[in-house]
């Protein structure tokens, strides 16, 4: 905590500028008006303040806004955002996507910190749902964002937002998450033709039920083995050898390399040997 001392004569800051770089902590505390700081927050990011100086500036804002900062200040926090605690952020009401983008930009290139997670949570809760623009923004900064949400949180994602999802955004999703996302994707892409539909739905198929896989097998989609290996075991087991052959197309030969891994292993054990032999791959049930 910086002591309360009078500002030395001639050192009262008329504006936030580089002349403050070399102010000591107590001088910043005594000589920088908090209201001035709040209105000129955008300038702070251009000035090489040290960690310690930023602590003082944050303290001044905390005193000015004990109930939480207004969005006009939050939007221009810049590097000062990295000084905020999750407790600070829980006091905020962030509604503008531009504010969210500005703060995510500050943390760019780093792991999602507790501060960022809290900010996103506040923002999404404030909006009521994870709309397309928000999802677009979040996955651009954090490709794994979607898979960090619980199935319950994912249920608030409207089907229209699914258009913002890229395949890499689903890389770390588990089956429970894909179970929630797949029906939304199916709805979102329902008006697309066969081949285009498959390209879009492919990353979500880890949540697809048996009947949808059967339907896909009738469309010459040539699913690759990587996608097949991510399918739900319980959805794959009822498929016939003929259906799997149609589903995989030329990729069916890859089953041999995966015969010891789920879901291929479990599926093989469910098939009649005669049917497996028709594939000519030497699969043993």
């Amino acid at each position: 905590e910086v002591e309360k001392t009078a500002c030395p004569s001639g050192k009262k800051a008329p504006e936030i500028d580089e002349s403050l770089i070399f102010y000591k902590k107590w001088e910043l505390e005594a000589c920088v008006d908090a209201a001035l700081l709040a209105t000129q927050m955008d300038r702070v990011n251009a000035i090489p303040f040290t960690y310690e100086q930023l602590d003082v500036l944050k303290h001044k804002l905390d005193e000015l806004y004990p109930q939480g900062y207004p969005e006009s200040v939050i939007q221009h926090l810049g590097y000062l955002f990295l000084k905020m605690s999750p407790e600070d952020i829980r006091k905020w009401n962030v509604t503008s996507l531009e504010t969210l983008k500005a703060l995510l930009e500050v943390n760019k290139g780093h792991e999602m910190s507790p501060q960022v997670a809290t900010l996103i949570d506040r923002f999404v809760k404030g909006r009521g749902q994870l709309d397309k623009d928000t999802l677009d923004t979040l996955t651009a900064f954090y490709p794994g964002y979607l898979c960090s949400l619980s199935p319950e949180e994912l249920s608030s994602v409207p089907p229209s937002s699914i258009w913002a999802v890229r395949p890499q955004d689903l890389d770390t999703c588990d089956p429970r998450q894909l179970d929630v996302l797949y029906p939304k994707a199916r709805l979102a892409f329902q008006n697309m033709n066969g081949s285009e539909y498959f390209v879009k739905i492919q990353s979500f198929l880890g949540g697809a039920p048996t009947e949808d896989l059967k339907a896909l097998s009738q469309q010459n989609v040539s699913m690759d083995l990587a996608t097949f290996m991510k399918l739900r075991t319980d959805a794959v087991l009822p498929l016939t050898v003929a259906e799997v052959q149609k589903l995989l197309g030329p990729h069916v030969e890859g089953l041999k390399a995966e015969e010891r891994h789920r879901p291929v292993r479990d599926w093989i054990l469910r098939q009649r040997q005669d049917d497996l032999d028709t594939l000519g791959l030497g699969l043993q049930g």
Epitope: K11, P48, F49, T50
Partner: antibody, heavy 119, light 106 residues
Framework: EFQLQQSGPELVKPGASVKISCKTS????????MNWVKQSNGKSLEWIGV????????GYNQKFKGKATLTVDQSSSTAYMQLNSLTSEDSAVYYC????????????WGHGTSVTVSS | QIVLTQSPAIMSASPGEKVTMTCSAS?????MHWYQQKSGTSPKRWIY???KLASGVPARFSGSGSGTSYSLTISSMEAEDAATYYC?????????FGGGTKLEIK
Amino acid sequence: EFQLQQSGPELVKPGASVKISCKTSGYSFTDYNMNWVKQSNGKSLEWIGVINPNYGTTGYNQKFKGKATLTVDQSSSTAYMQLNSLTSEDSAVYYCARGGYDGEAMDYWGHGTSVTVSS
Amino acid sequence: QIVLTQSPAIMSASPGEKVTMTCSASSSVNYMHWYQQKSGTSPKRWIYDTSKLASGVPARFSGSGSGTSYSLTISSMEAEDAATYYCQQWSSYPPTFGGGTKLEIK
């Protein structure tokens, strides 16, 4: 042991540019600002500018704006100063100097890099 | 910008003698820093925040002053103290240095 290891002497032609490096060790590079100071042939010292290695933010002496550009590479804990459009007036020894905690002067200095501008 | 004027520009002292050099600022500053530089080497922080001695600086050195007038004093001159001393302020932007006082041993 804190160290600020500067690049070697430079002999450059008028109008050219030069980039001086200052590799640091022994402390957390991003925790302290880095200053650059000019000393012309044994004369006094002139402050050029300062950079915050954590954010890349800079402050310059008006006299050196457009002449000097300060940058850092966090991965190698190195600060750089580029000097442009060199003239004989720029011939000097240039020092990097770490900013002390809470404005407590410049506590550690590099050994200096001599720049000579001559045709 | 604040101009710092050091005096004298050159001085010499005998071993054991008391030495005082001054630094006058064109406007009031809150703190003064002092650096020692020996020929062919980089400056070293010597006294900071007007009166605090940097690590390794002998106790015979002291600093004082306020406003526009500051000084560095050596209570008893030793041969190793021969060097140029620069004062520096960063109370006002941009930071500035004095022209230096060259201290020689008699």
